[in-house]
């Protein structure tokens, strides 16, 4: 008789999941020199560890702590790039600007990319069927307390110009809710962040609106002031435009708004 | 190109109230805070007071119960009411546009405009 | 509110010279410094931000350093423009407060 499991609303672990994280912690150490030192497979106990026989709605940063400390990395604090719902752009724009990182560019969030995992509480199983949702079942959960985690991290680090690449598609184009919104934004460091720059990418190849002038942004603008930290904003209106500018600068159509 | 420009009296009785205008040209003050600031002769400078793009102030707490700063986005104004008014006073006062979107320090000035308080 | 001093009050250099101007905070103000140049009867003209940034169109001989309380603005060869008053403006706090000028005259 098969053992009777908890049914979450959200998707299972996803397959091949140990395979995955030690393949891409060898292929990051690998191609990061500055990370060659770290040892995967201890990378991926120290994961496993974090969640593994525990109750995936009772996680705490605390988990993963011994993770953090075997993934501690050191970016340049005045090239990081934050997100909001426009990730693939994001991560396209620090492919061609190698000097510039987001998240997803180190090594644990390099790790945890588009992967979700959840173990049960008191068995060393992998729960493949289904883990629980931050809305409609916990917040608490392995995967949005990592992100919490690794997020706060890297915005403490951040320093001088910190740019932020938000979407104007959205009906929210600044969302208090994202993680950006409800971890990044509150653990930047006024005593080391100047600025937040916020590039606006519109959707519509006609799309000519300010929308630096959008309620959102001026939302974010208010929160970040208050936080003593200057705001500038700049609208991308043609992010096809920007990145080709950004890997031929000197091209004669890139001396115009973009 | 960006442009900033007081007007307004060159001179004003003690007790009254200073009032100066700032027209700005090359950007929108719905994208930029305006700073006023004053420098009297032969002295250092004083910060005065910013309105925000959205429209919210603040105000240096030496100056506070006596200045308002008020905006005409329409126009691409901003107003300085500084009332009752002493000889020291006296000063070239500046409006000037914040670097960035909600920028403390200042990247465009304008030319400056003498007041002198003298009955 | 955090009070600037600026030291020495005046310099008299002459044209090629190395100039070194001294701006301190009353407090830790994090980098947030400014440097402006003033010119007889024109307005301020920013030089430098956040310590060390050089405002476009502005010389490679203007440079800024420091940190915490103590910050500098180094001119590396003094040319003939470059003589007027120099002002350190900190934007860590309300009000922004600046220094009483460095002047810098022709010897």
């Known amino acids: 008789v098969p053992r009777w499991r908890q049914q979450w609303s959200g998707p299972g672990t996803t397959k091949r999941f140990p395979e995955t994280v030690l393949a891409r912690c060898v292929k990051y150490t690998e191609i990061h020199p500055e990370m060659r030192h770290v040892d995967c497979q201890s990378v991926w106990d120290a994961f496993k560890g974090a969640f593994i026989s525990k109750h995936p709605c009772n996680i705490t940063e605390e988990d993963y702590q011994p993770l953090m400390k075997l993934g501690t990395q050191t970016v340049p604090c005045n090239k990081i790039l934050l997100w909001s719902r426009i990730k693939d752009l994001a991560h396209q724009f620090t492919q061609v600007q190698r000097d510039m990182f987001t998240l997803e560019d180190t090594l644990l969030g390099y790790l945890a990319d588009d992967l979700t995992w959840c173990g049960e509480f008191n068995t060393s199983k992998i729960n493949y069927q289904s883990c629980p949702d931050w809305r409609k079942d916990c917040s608490n959960n392995p995967v949005s307390v990592f992100w919490k985690t690794v997020s706060r991290r890297f915005a403490e680090a951040a320093c001088d110009v910190v740019h932020v690449m938000l979407n104007g598609s959205r009906s929210k184009i600044f969302d208090k809710n994202s993680t950006f919104g409800s971890v990044e934004v509150h653990n930047l460091q006024p005593e080391k962040v100047q600025t937040l720059e916020a590039w606006v990418i519109h959707g519509g190849r006609e799309d000519s609106r300010d929308l630096c002038q959008d309620p959102t942004i001026k939302e974010l603008e208010s929160i970040i002031s208050k936080r003593n930290i200057q705001f500038s904003c700049k609208n991308i209106y043609r992010p096809d435009k920007f990145l080709q500018c950004v890997k031929n600068p000197e091209d004669s159509s890139c001396t115009s708004e973009i | 190109q960006v442009q900033l420009q007081e007007s307004g009296p060159g001179l004003v009785k003690p007790s009254e109230t200073l009032s100066l205008t700032c027209t700005v040209s090359g950007f929108s003050l719905t994208s930029y805070g305006i700073h006023w600031l004053r420098q009297p002769p032969g002295k250092g400078l004083e910060w005065i007071g910013v309105i925000w793009r959205g429209g919210s102030t603040d105000y240096n707490p030496s100056l506070k119960s006596r200045v308002t700063i008020s905006k005409d986005t329409s126009k691409s104004q901003v107003s300085l009411k500084l009332s009752s008014v002493t000889a020291a006073d006296t000063a070239v006062y500046y409006c000037?546009?914040?670097?960035?979107?909600?920028?403390?320090?200042?990247?465009?000035w304008g030319q400056g405009t003498l007041v002198t308080v003298s009955s | 509110e955090i009070v600037m001093t600026q030291s020495p009050p005046t310099l008299s250099l002459s044209p090629g010279e190395r100039v070194t101007l001294s701006c301190r905070a009353s407090?830790?103000?994090?980098?947030?410094l400014v440097w402006y140049q003033q010119k007889p009867g024109q307005a301020p003209r920013l030089l430098i931000s956040?310590?060390?940034s050089l405002e476009t169109s502005i010389p490679a001989r203007f440079s800024g350093s420091g940190s915490g309380t103590d910050y500098t603005l180094t001119i590396s060869s003094l040319q003939p423009e470059d003589f007027a008053v120099y002002y350190c403006?900190?934007?860590?706090?309300?009000?922004?407060?600046f220094g009483q000028g460095t002047k810098v005259e022709i010897k």
């Open positions: 407090e830790d103000i994090y980098n947030r």
């Open positions: 403006q900190q934007y860590w706090s309300t009000p922004y407060t």
């Open positions: 956040g310590v060390t």
């Open positions: 000037a546009k914040g670097k960035v979107t909600t920028g403390f320090y200042f990247d465009f």
